[in-house]
């Protein structure tokens, strides 16, 4: 478990552009601190790949049932993974028909975690 | 053009550390994804892991965890793989291999020349 | 772990025949599969990506199919520069596994 005094505070600052195909998805994490410009959605994906989405986005929200039906179902204790848990992040296009260059803002890492290629993160202490 | 260069071939003794870069031109460095892969003599392709240049995260392949350590340094667009602790059956070339594509996909576009990594008392 | 199993190991063909190599995926990966050629003493080559959508710039006598566990890559008129190990590469999880390959030889 980080140390909840010194745990580092994770930031969106753009937002995917694309649907993340549903199937691709291993569950979320919502940033909804003050400290952040914007509230973000986290989908971390089976690659452990994490992607920040606009969580006003109605794909973004169906997503986000769709995750806590599927988690309800196989960890009725946890409704999503501890940031911990979230591994790595990656470069987007994310249609799986490639040929985009990674937009590194719009996948993000905590201090914490092991990959990412996007947003920034800082540590609040 | 795209283009990956790494170091040279690497002679070293059982229970040392080698460690290869992998220089990246042609693209931008922090904008993907690098991984590496090995190839013992004679044999198939191995993931080992990738390093996120952005912000130098990392994922391993379990059974390198605890022996490998992906590094990279941005202001010379390079990457680095360490691997510890040596055995004779690391013997191998190492590849670092970019990697093009999405949250959920994974494709290696271009790949380094190799670096032949022998292990011998 | 996912297992990728290439079959045949080696094959040998003529200059201008169609070459068929299969790879069984041991768990359901959709279209998660990739093909990469290998030439000796060189790096992979990407020439299939998502089971059957050719690389940019890779002639299209290369061709890939299939899904769920079972894909097919195939060359339809064998080059005398197509002699080489070939690979499928699964995404679908991780770790990211490989066949173990199929070496190509003409005859």
């Known amino acids: 478990q980080p140390d909840a005094v010194n745990a580092p505070l994770t930031c969106c600052y753009s937002f995917t552009s694309k649907m993340i195909p549903m199937s691709r998805l291993e569950s979320y994490k919502r940033i909804t601190s003050s400290r952040c410009p914007k509230e973000a959605v986290v989908f971390v994906t089976k690659l452990k790949r994490e992607v920040c989405a606009d969580p006003k986005k109605e794909w973004v929200q169906t997503y986000i049932k769709n995750l806590d039906r599927n988690q309800m179902r196989s960890e009725p204790t946890t409704l999503f993974k501890t940031a911990s848990a979230l591994r790595s992040s990656a470069p987007l296009n994310v249609k799986l028909t490639r040929k985009s260059e990674a937009n590194a803002s719009t996948t993000f890492s905590t201090t914490t975690s092991s990959t990412s290629v996007g947003v920034t993160s800082v540590t609040v202490n | 053009q795209v283009q990956l260069v790494q170091s040279g071939a690497e002679v070293k003794k059982p229970g040392a550390s080698v460690k290869v870069s992998c220089k990246a031109s042609g693209y931008t460095f922090t904008g993907y994804y690098l991984h590496w892969v090995r190839q013992a003599p004679g044999q198939g392709l191995e993931w080992m892991g990738w390093?996120?240049?952005?912000?130098?995260?990392?994922n391993y392949a379990q059974k390198f965890q605890g022996r490998v350590t992906m590094t990279r340094d941005t202001s010379i667009s390079t990457a680095y793989m360490e691997l510890s602790r040596l055995r004779s059956d690391d013997t191998a070339v190492y590849y670092c291999a970019r990697d093009i594509a999405a949250a959920g996909a994974v494709y290696f576009d271009y790949w380094g020349q190799g670096t032949l990594v022998t292990v011998s008392s | 772990d996912i297992q990728m199993t290439q079959s045949p190991s080696s094959l040998s063909a003529s200059v201008g025949d169609r070459v068929t190599i299969t790879c069984q995926a041991s768990q359901d990966i959709t279209t998660y599969l990739n093909w990469y050629q290998q030439k000796p003493g060189k790096a992979p080559k990407l020439l299939i990506y998502?089971?059957?959508n050719l690389e940019t710039g890779v002639p299209s006598r290369f061709s890939g199919s299939g899904s769920g566990t079972d894909f097919t890559f195939t060359i339809s008129s064998l080059q005398p520069e197509d002699i080489a190990t070939y690979y499928c590469q699964q995404y679908d999880n991780l770790p990211i596994t490989f066949g173990q390959g199929t070496r190509l030889e003409i005859k």
């Open positions: 998502d089971a059957s």
């Open positions: 390093i996120n240049p952005y912000n130098d995260g990392t």
